[in-house]
Amino acid sequence: CDLPQTHSLGNRRALILLAQMGRISHFSCLKDRYDFGFPQEVFDGNQFQKAQAISAFHEMIQQTFNLFSTKDSSAAWDETLLDKFYIELFQQLNDLEACVTQEVGVEEIALMNEDSILAVRKYFQRITLYLMGKKYSPCAWEVVRAEIMRSFSFSTNLQKGLRRKD
């Protein structure tokens, strides 16, 4: 499966929207930094097959969608930007779903990528617990936004790599 160029552009647009969503001066949030333990090894294209990497990307975008779809998230961010962000994520989910099913049979996906999907879910679980512990404070959301931007940037670079390998 060749990930369409539009997917990469969508990922870039999602990153730009995330960057625009900041509401407070992030300089006041240094003390709220936290180690979420981004599962970098899951996205390592050298260690895992393409289908597994794509499956992990899919899970990450799905979890990002879930995280930013909550009531607490809606209260934290600008509604217009959030809606645009949802559209970009939704489009990426569609691109990746088509790609995963093309790479391997649907019934094989769940078994084959169980570990990588679980690692991504645990990562987002840590993010959710952090937000809960910080009572969804503006700084906690800023830290999470920065973290999601970093993980998106990382996966975008790897997706470029996956396209080049074809």
């Epitope: 960057a19 900041g22 001066s25 992030h26 300089f27 006041s28 949030c29 240094l30 003390k31 709220d32 930094r33 936290y34 180690d35 979420f36 800023e142 830290v143 920065a146 973290e147 931007m149 970093r150 940037s153």
Partner: antibody, heavy 121, light 107 residues
Framework: EVQLVQSGAEVKKPGESLKISCKGS????????IGWVRQMPGKGLEWMGI????????AYSPSFQGQVTISADKSISTAYLQWSSLKASDTAMYYC??????????????WGQGTLVTVSS | DIQMTQSPSSLSASVGDRVTITCRAS??????LNWYQQKPGKAPKLLIY???SLQSGVPSRFSGSGSGTDFTLTISSLQPEDFATYYC?????????FGQGTKVEIK
């Protein structure tokens, strides 16, 4: 390879203006903040201020607030430190350094080579 | 502002010695502390971040410990290239502040 390359040494007279630069390469310039650090001759390190190139938001040390201006041009991956009126006491080595922002990553992991500013009449 | 105080200001040691430098913060900074090495005419180099994490490429003879207000940088076996000035820096809040430095000299 991540690099921060600073502009060359400057010799100025008191009262003159100056703008020094720090160009980042080998990484996403807008994903990191750029901090500025002063080191006067034979002295220690002093943090001056920082900029987020993605939106040009800045924070200054109270000691340097109003004395210098930090700016950035993300289109050319460059941060700047400027003075409108130099004093002899501004004579120092000035370093720029990369900061991970709110991410859990090493602070000031890459530094520029430094720009020596000499202010003398 | 958070004050960072290093001790000693300077020390003399021999190659192979175990060297310990301490840094004290004027208030709790959790583990938001970094250690840098600077050699004459060169830019500082990050050694340790978040109190105890070794920066990539830094020899394992360097280690950091501590949390709250008291921190330590240890060089387990001093090498000729380790003679330099060492700075601690808090990164919990602005303004970011450095210790005054500890110069490690040859005995």
């Amino acid at each position: 390879e991540v690099q921060l390359v600073q502009s060359g040494a400057e010799v100025k007279k008191p009262g003159e203006s100056l703008k020094i630069s720090c160009k980042g390469s080998g990484y996403s310039f807008t994903s990191y903040w750029i901090g500025w650090v002063r080191q006067m001759p034979g002295k220690g390190l002093e943090w001056m201020g920082i900029i987020d190139p993605s939106d040009s938001d800045t924070a200054y040390s109270p000691s340097f607030q109003g004395q210098v201006t930090i700016s950035a041009d993300k289109s050319i991956s460059t941060a700047y430190l400027q003075w409108s009126s130099l004093k002899a006491s501004d004579t120092a080595m000035y370093y720029c350094a990369r900061h991970p922002g709110l991410n859990w990553a090493p602070d000031f992991d890459y530094w520029g080579q430094g720009t020596l500013v000499t202010v003398s009449s | 502002d958070i004050q960072m105080t290093q001790s000693p200001s300077s020390l003399s040691a021999s190659v192979g010695d175990r060297v310990t430098i301490t840094c004290r913060a004027s208030q709790s900074i959790a583990e938001f502390l970094n250690w840098y090495q600077q050699k004459p005419g060169k830019a500082p180099k990050l050694l340790i971040y978040f109190a105890s994490s070794l920066q990539s490429g830094v020899p394992s003879r360097f280690s950091g410990s501590g949390s709250g207000t008291d921190f330590t940088l240890t060089i387990s076996s001093l090498q000729p290239e380790d003679f330099a000035t060492y700075y601690c820096q808090q990164s919990i809040d602005f303004p970011l502040t450095f210790g005054q430095g500890t110069k490690v000299e040859i005995k």
